[in-house]
Interface confidence: low
């Protein structure tokens, strides 16, 4: 039928289809309308009705134009260690990303099931790779003129400084001690701190229940740092 | 009406794997979280699991990893609990329960009667 | 883990009499303002039974002698005036993160 004049409901010519946001309806055979985003199919069509749409509840999505009897829940809250980026709306779903100094350590489709902080790296190890969204940070020893004397998932192992008269040698966790004044440092451009990387993952991207009226639950995983590996934390 | 409908009893040897089912009805299957809950004889109440059946979502119980695997077949609106490797201590009552998630509050509303499992040699 | 602690792990109490059952948790099962904190009833040889949920509310269908009070780590569950159906084991547990967690359950007999 010409698009001008084909009001929903409406029999598709043989062998055709549904226009845009609108969709065949196997028992009336018909082609209905769909609901908006934030919408959800209250009734179906009839041969001689269209769709009745009807807002979703409270906690509750959807995020396409749909003729879903029921709008999609909501993920479950952001737990501790994430914080919330995107609201849960009646078009969209809540979205949880990892707070910074923490990293997605078991993704899933379009989010994070599991945020773990980064690992530190103890004294007399630096960090030989810094975090990402989706990576821990890798620590390494400190080498022989270098030393890191502090516990971080940022710093990695700086040079030791030069001194005229050494009074106690550095080692890979305590600079050098000098006699002298006016120690001269041997220091590459922008060795000391690495900057922490900011995670943009999100959490939940499925539906989860709301009670009486929607569906249920939520899993806000617990989350420990990393168990101590060589060069962590946790001498 | 809301329903769950779980398996009968089930005897099983140790070292055996056993599935046991969830038969739901009365609700929109994929849209409510399903749990699994153990409980031992004259004992207390164990959370195992839980699945989201709209995409098989899972979050275990770390004590349940490997033990226990959770999956749904939307189109028989039914949820299921593989147990592997069975010992003693996996002789039990298991409870389905689907949760429901309030705009502020979290709980389990339903629950199955509940699946009972003896491991005996 | 969260660990919820129950108390005492059984009571007997005197037909309309008041039961009182303790949870604490090792840490605060509170979150933006509300508890996640949930009490249920089971009877032997039955799955348990929802009785009220984030620490106060109750559902429909459960009597109004049924109360809970609390917030952060202390939980209480009241039932006054205790009738005979209400022996049987109860259980808190909480849903502020995952694993979930049961309270070792209080025995409730009546006198």
């Known amino acids: 039928l010409p698009a001008q004049v084909a009001f929903t409901p409406y029999a598709p010519e043989p062998g055709g289809t549904c226009r845009l946001r609108e969709y065949y309806d196997q028992t009336a055979q018909m082609c209905c309308s769909k609901c908006p985003p934030g919408q959800h199919a209250k009734v179906f069509c009839t041969k001689t009705s269209d769709t009745v749409c009807d807002s979703c509840e409270d906690s509750t999505y959807t995020q396409l134009w749909n003729w879903v009897p029921e709008c999609l829940s909501c993920g479950s809250r952001c737990s501790s260690d994430q914080v919330e980026t995107q609201a849960c709306t009646r078009e969209q779903n809540r979205i949880c990303t990892c707070r910074p100094g923490w990293y997605c350590a078991l993704s899933k489709q379009e989010g994070c099931r599991l945020c773990a902080q980064l690992r530190k790296c103890r004294p007399g190890f630096g960090v030989a790779r810094p975090g990402t969204e989706t990576s821990d940070v890798v620590c390494k020893p400190c080498a022989p003129g270098t030393f890191s004397n502090t516990t971080s998932s940022t710093d990695i192992c700086r040079p030791h400084q030069i001194c005229h008269v050494v009074a106690i040698p550095g080692n890979a966790s305590m600079d050098a001690v000098c006699t002298s004044t006016s120690p001269t440092r041997s220091m590459a451009p922008g060795a000391v701190h690495l900057p922490q990387p900011v995670s943009t993952r999100s959490q939940h991207t499925q539906p989860t229940p709301a009670p009486s009226t929607a569906p249920g639950t939520s899993f806000l995983l617990p989350v420990g740092p990393s168990p101590p590996a060589e060069g962590s934390t946790g001498d | 009406e809301v329903q769950l409908q779980q398996s009968g009893t089930v005897l099983a040897r140790p070292g055996a794997s056993v599935k046991m089912s969830c038969k739901t009805s009365?609700?929109?299957?994929?849209?409510?979280?399903m749990h699994w809950v153990k409980q031992r004889p004259g004992q207390g109440l164990e959370w195992i699991g839980t699945?989201?059946?709209?995409?098989?979502?899972?979050s275990y119980n770390q004590k349940f990893k490997g033990k226990a695997k959770l999956t749904a077949v939307t189109s028989a609106s039914t949820a299921y609990m593989e147990l592997n490797s069975l010992t003693n201590e996996d002789s039990a009552v298991f409870y389905c329960?689907?949760?429901?998630?309030?705009?502020?509050?979290?709980?389990?509303?339903?629950w199955g009667q509940g699946t009972t499992l003896t491991v005996s040699s | 883990d969260i660990v919820m602690t129950q108390s005492p792990a059984s009571l007997a109490v005197s037909l309309g009499q008041r039961a009182t059952i303790s949870c604490k948790a090792s840490?605060?099962?509170?979150?933006?303002?509300?508890?996640?904190l949930n009490w249920y009833q089971q009877k032997p040889g039955q799955p348990p039974k929802l009785l009220i949920y984030?620490?106060?509310n109750l559902p429909s269908g459960i009597p109004a002698r049924f109360s809970g009070s609390g917030s952060g780590t202390d939980f209480t569950l009241n039932i006054h005036p205790v009738e005979e159906e209400d022996a049987a084991t109860y259980y808190c547990q909480q849903s502020n993160e995952d694993p979930r967690t049961f309270g070792g359950g209080t025995k409730l007999e009546i006198k």
């Open positions: 009365g609700y929109t299957f994929t849209s409510y979280w």
């Open positions: 840490q605060s099962v509170d979150y933006d303002g509300d508890s996640y």
């Open positions: 699945i989201y059946p709209g995409n098989s979502d899972t």
């Open positions: 329960t689907r949760e429901n998630l309030l705009l502020r509050s979290y709980f389990f509303d339903y």
């Open positions: 984030a620490a106060s």
